[in-house]
Amino acid sequence: FERTRSLQDPCSNCPAGTFCDNNRNQICSPCPPNSFSSAGGQRTCDICRQCKGVFRTRKECSSTSNAECDCTPGFHCLGAGCSMCEQDCKQGQELTKKGCKDCCFGTFNDQKRGICRPWTNCSLDGKSVLVNGTKERDVVCGPSPADLSPGASSVTPPAPAREPGHSPQ
């Protein structure tokens, strides 16, 4: 009998949203308020994450899944599962330890987050500059100078694509 019990753990029958209550003869009890179990067979429920202060609730906690947080306006998420909120800056700025700072000449940032980056040096990739860079935009590189024959019609290029926007996956 004991061998059968050890092979067939009664706790394995407890579904997500419950826990195996040792105090009640290993009965499956529902997770108490503000707690959850996302998998079956758990002996405890995990405390729900609370989205406080600069964090706001993106998804409420349920008996089977944790709450999910994002950031209040003016801040953006960092880290796995939005573990931190970081202050936004304007495009053309970067966040330093002293706050938001304008990008220096020759650098750009087209996001509200991240660093000011040097403009791409088109010539290093054998190309020429089609559109000059600004504080908010990288240069746009085009064909190499040799590819631009005299008298070729000049076409206005499309606006540069946005830099990577690191939205949580």
Epitope: H76, C77, L78, G79, E86, E94, L95, T96, K97, K98, C104, T107, R113, G114, I115, P118, T120, N121, L124, D125, D138, V139, C141, P160, A161, R162, E163, P164, G165, H166, S167, Q169
Partner: antibody, heavy 120, light 106 residues
């Protein structure tokens, strides 16, 4: 599961070029800059440059300017690093690494590395 | 160009605290990141933005940064912590790594 899988080891002669690939999976490839870092045997880490997978914009370490070209193929979620005019001092393990989020530019995920041996 | 200076090696007994320094001019104004690299493996980010830990990195790893020195602290050191450790910063146009510190667990 996020992964950066690099191409296999290469043996090259001095003066030749090598092109190493880095295939990304498990995340939005276009959403994160990709960097290349190398490490010579018994030495430290040396940054080579980055590519913006969305626009193709690049930035190279001064030491490698004129010899390195970093490109990407967004449809294949793959970044490439080509190094030309190889010399014996270029023998190293070459890593691709994904840039993290926010300020300060950290490299939060690395490929397994590709050994490039330059020998006559 | 910006330079980061690390001690080549640090030794520590198991269970004790290891401190690895990274020196640079006014480094306290920059965000410092730390990587652990074990032999034959790729580097792994263990601390970012001076003192934040990626998920999966034990709480024993912590960081600080002020003035001209950033420090990686590993408390209750284990044999598995034996590795090379690199600090890294972004400096206006390039990514800069320290020379690396080999941590030996005695």
């Amino acid at each position: 599961q996020m992964q950066l899988v690099q191409s296999g080891a290469e043996v090259k002669k001095p003066g030749a070029s090598v092109k190493v690939s880095c295939k990304a999976s498990g995340y939005n490839f276009a959403g994160y800059y990709m960097h290349w870092v190398r490490q010579a045997p018994g030495q430290g880490l040396e940054w080579m440059g980055w590519v913006n997978p969305q626009s193709g914009g690049t930035n190279y370490a001064q030491k490698f300017q004129g010899r390195v070209t970093i490109t990407r193929d967004t449809s294949a979620s793959t970044a490439y690093m080509e190094l030309s005019s190889l010399r014996s001092e270029d023998t190293a393990v070459y890593y691709c690494a994904r840039e993290g989020e926010g300020r300060g530019l950290d490299l939060d995920w690395w490929g397994q590395g590709t050994l490039v041996t330059v020998s006559s | 160009s910006y330079e980061l200076t690390q001690p080549p090696s640090v030794s520590v007994a198991p269970g004790k605290t290891a401190r690895i320094t990274c020196g640079g001019n006014n480094i306290g104004s920059k965000s410092v990141h730390w990587y652990q690299q074990k032999p034959g493996q790729a580097p792994v980010l263990v601390i970012y933005y001076d003192s934040d830990r990626p998920s999966g990195i034990p709480e024993r790893f912590s960081g600080s940064n002020s003035g001209n020195t950033a420090t990686l602290t590993i408390s209750r050191v284990e044999a598995g912590d034996e590795a090379d450790y690199y600090c890294q910063v972004w400096d206006s146009s390039s990514v800069v790594f320290g020379g690396g510190t080999q941590l030996t667990v005695l």
